[in-house]
């Protein structure tokens, strides 16, 4: 089930500059780049029970993948 | 299912240049972080360094002036040379891609034994 | 390069047991409210496998014994009830920064 999106503004870095709906968060680049570009998770298969992870990594309310994978489990990534 | 495989001499003489390729199914290496790590017999892991989705890389500095990653897109492998290896390069090397956006190494390869001896 | 501490090196236990293994990174590993800390488990002659990712996350397909906590620069794998499957070598790994890196490796061994 998806969380509601948290702050971004982490303990050790200023939060970075919010990426549009499409792109995602590089942490090793620090920078907005296409989601495609990212091994970003696949939706899992029926029955899969993996917790979900408590937040990720895309500064957006949004999910920041594309339209094809807005059911990712995922908020978007910080 | 993402599948990484390792390949490459498992015998290299001092002085001389490793060479080892990682082939990939199941996903694209112009998506994402693809890594070396490597494990000396009996000893922990070191990681080596990525190529990325763009082709940048990055190289951990223990090593950095021996190592080059590359890749190969049209046959979705990636590369590593390591140069004037000696005795203390004998280890077991992965290659390894990690998820977004935990950066976590979730796929692994087997694992390929590489031994530097004259 | 943030390094990380982990104990004990190695330790003795029965199945049933619960075992509990620490993780201190030099420096925070948190960044952006995740805690980029992740557990691996190796057997001998095989890649290590994913447990827990993310501090506290199961890795595909991991068996709900393993659990992890912590955040900032202090880390906890737990296992609740030792299987026989479980005697292995477990790694703690940081993933805020490259170089990424490991710990040195606790060997769970039987009593």
């Known amino acids: 089930m998806r969380r509601g999106p948290r702050s971004l503004r982490g303990r050790d870095a200023p939060a970075p500059t919010p990426c549009v709906p499409a792109e995602c968060f590089d942490l090793l680049v620090r920078h907005c780049v296409a989601c495609g570009l990212l091994r970003t998770p696949r939706p899992k298969p029926a029955g899969a029970s993996s917790p979900a992870p408590r937040t990720a990594l895309q500064p957006q309310e949004s999910v920041g993948a594309g339209a094809g994978e807005a059911a990712l489990p995922l908020p978007g990534l910080l | 299912e993402v599948q990484l495989q390792e390949s490459g001499p498992g015998l290299v003489k001092p002085s001389e240049t490793l060479s080892l390729t990682c082939s990939v199914s199941?996903?694209?290496?112009?998506?994402?972080?693809w890594n070396w790590i490597r494990q000396p017999p009996g000893k922990g892991l070191e990681y080596i360094g990525y190529i990325s989705y763009s082709g940048s890389t990055y190289y951990n500095p223990s090593l950095k002036s021996r190592v080059t990653i590359s890749r190969d897109t049209s046959k979705n492998q990636y590369s590593l040379r390591l140069s004037s290896v000696t005795a203390a390069d004998t280890a077991l090397y992965y290659c390894a891609s990690p998820n977004y956006p935990f950066y976590a190494m979730d796929y692994w390869g087997q694992g390929t034994r590489v031994t530097v001896s004259s | 390069d943030i390094v990380m501490t982990q104990s004990p090196s190695s330790l003795s236990a029965s199945v049933g047991d619960r075992v509990t293994i620490t993780c201190r990174a030099s420096e925070s590993v948190d960044n952006y409210g995740i805690s980029f800390m992740n557990w691996f488990q190796q057997k001998p002659g095989k890649a290590p496998k994913l447990l827990i990712y993310a501090a506290s996350n199961l890795g595909s397909g991991v068996p709900s014994r393993f659990s992890g906590s912590g955040s900032g620069t202090d880390f906890t794998l737990t296992i609740s009830s030792l299987q026989p499957e479980d005697f292995a070598t477990y790694y703690c790994?940081?993933?805020?920064?490259?170089?990424?890196?490991f710990g040195q490796g606790t060997k769970v061994e039987i009593k």
């Open positions: 790994q940081q993933s805020k920064e490259v170089p990424w890196t």
């Open positions: 199941g996903d694209s290496i112009t998506s994402g972080y």
